[in-house]
Interface confidence: medium
Amino acid sequence: GWVWNQFFVPEEMNTTSHHIGQLRSDLDNGNNSFQYKLLGAGAGSTFIIDERTGDIYAIQKLDREERSLYILRAQVIDIATGRAVEPESEFVIKVSDINDNEPKFLDEPYEAIVPEMSPEGTLVIQVTASDADDPSSGNNARLLYSLLQGQPYFSVEPTTGVIRISSKMDRELQDEYWVIIQAKDMIGQPGALSGTTSVLIKLSDVNDNKPIFKESLYRLTVSESAPTGTSIGTIMAYDNDIGENAEMDYSIEEDDSQTFDIITNHETQEGIVILKKKVDFEHQNHYGIRAKVKNHHVPEQLMKYHTEASTTFIKIQVEDVDEP
């Protein structure tokens, strides 16, 4: 019968000839009366056999990631008779892995959106690297993820690549972050190879800012000849939020005279001061009103940011008109 052990050849061997093992018949008494032959894909080009001893050699550098096993056939012939000593047999040469491939992130570019002020632990995105080395061969393809850039706002779970928030972020201070993740094979041990990827994390707006008046005091004038409904001027608040979170409504907080009103221009987000009833210079030549501004949409959970609406004082001077 045939005698052999399992055949392994390390990939990427630089030697011109690397001994893999020996194929022999148990009928071979070592007197060189048998001839061994190798057949199949790779026979003669990648692998050769010593016809007398049955020793098998690899004569080419191999790449496991290109081909991880070779199935060959062996024959043994009695030189004197030309007959097969053993039935032809199939055997396998496995290419054993070395750590020659760095981890690669295949789904780049990564981009994620997460609401500002999200609590610690909020999941942002999962990044995954692939390593072409053999996952069953030691730690060559066992990866560990780490954060190269992004502290203290983000963290990455070492074994899963899940990125989480580790510190609250305010979009109004910074609206996007570049996080750099490294994947290292050999679970970080010496000889490890690594790959990196960048993740663009954008913060979406939440309504965490109330509108605030640009000026604490406004002055407007109104002619005593102005009809009711006249727009006498505008006031404006600013809101650091964006979109519908910055939409606001103006209103009168205080006007003992009940002479003025404020309407909101939702296009420009300005407050328009309107004359509600006619004024008379001889009766009163200036007025003071207090206006307030609030956001249009405030979810219940964000009301804590909107206590005490911003107010402004508007001093309105009446202009005299010569009366006939």
Partner: antibody, heavy 119, light 107 residues
Framework: QVQLVESGGGVVQPGGSLRLSCAAS????????MDWVRQAPGKGLEWVAV????????YYADSVRGRFTISRDNSKNTLFLQMNSLRVEDTAVYYC????????????WGRGTLVTVSS | EIVLTQSPGTLSLSPGERATLSCRAS???????LAWYQQRPGQAPRLLIY???SRATGIPDRFSGSGSGTDFTLTISSLEPEDFAVYYC????????FGQGTKVEIK
């Protein structure tokens, strides 16, 4: 004649208090909004506070809000500025000034009173 | 807050010469809401011009104001000895702020 005369200035330690007065004469005091404006030594003018003709509205510069209080007594034609928690940077000549009826610029000023805050 | 910047800081001129003082605002000021004041040493400020170009009561016509938007000018056509003083611009359209002053001194 038409005039404003300030009084009540002096030297005070940081954290201390002073009350300035401004006596008006020669015009209808109760018809005018009144202001305090200050001038630090060798510096420019800085508006401090305003009070409406009837005392109904008051407003303050950010630098003094919460520490200074403007008030008036129309029956005595007098404007006041109560200054608490004084700071070294409050050292200045304090002027009272009248706002015009048709606008909000100052058409009449007093000669000023010097407030020195020093330890 | 509207910031007013006056230039030059000091103007050295002789009596009889023309003085041109500039006041620039950090944002547009309605011309109705700009005033100029004169302050002589040891005295209170005195209103010269309001509404950018209207002379206050009792102010000689050698003083004139002009400008709009963010650039305003006070002109003294022929300097008299009593005109050597510090001049301040003030906006009163949105709260009250003053420029840092221009000193007109005798050359």
């Amino acid at each position: 004649q038409v005039q404003l005369v300030e009084s009540g200035g002096g030297v005070v330690q940081p954290g201390g208090s002073l009350r300035l007065s401004c006596a008006a004469s020669g015009f209808s005091f109760s018809s005018y909004d009144m202001d305090w404006v200050r001038q630090a030594p060798g510096k420019g003018l800085e508006w401090v506070a305003v009070i409406w003709y009837d005392g109904s509205n008051k407003y303050y510069a950010d630098s003094v809000r919460g520490r200074f209080t403007i008030s008036r007594d129309n029956s005595k034609n007098t404007l006041f500025l109560q200054m608490n928690s004084l700071r070294v940077e409050d050292t200045a000549v304090y002027y009272c000034a009248r706002e015009t009826g048709e606008g909000w610029y100052f058409d009449l000023w007093g000669r000023g009173t010097l407030v020195t805050v020093s330890s | 807050e509207i910031v007013l910047t006056q230039s030059p800081g000091t103007l050295s001129l002789s009596p009889g010469e023309r003085a041109t003082l500039s006041c620039r605002a950090s944002q547009s000021v309605s011309s109705s809401y700009l005033a100029w004041y004169q302050q002589r040493p040891g005295q209170a400020p005195r209103l010269l011009i309001y509404g950018a170009s209207s002379r206050a009561t009792g102010i000689p016509d050698r003083f004139s104001g002009s400008g709009s938007g963010t650039d305003f000018t006070l002109t003294i056509s022929s300097l008299e000895p009593e005109d050597f003083a510090v001049y301040y611009c003030q906006q009163y359209g949105s709260s009250w702020t003053f420029g840092q002053g221009t000193k007109v001194e005798i050359k």
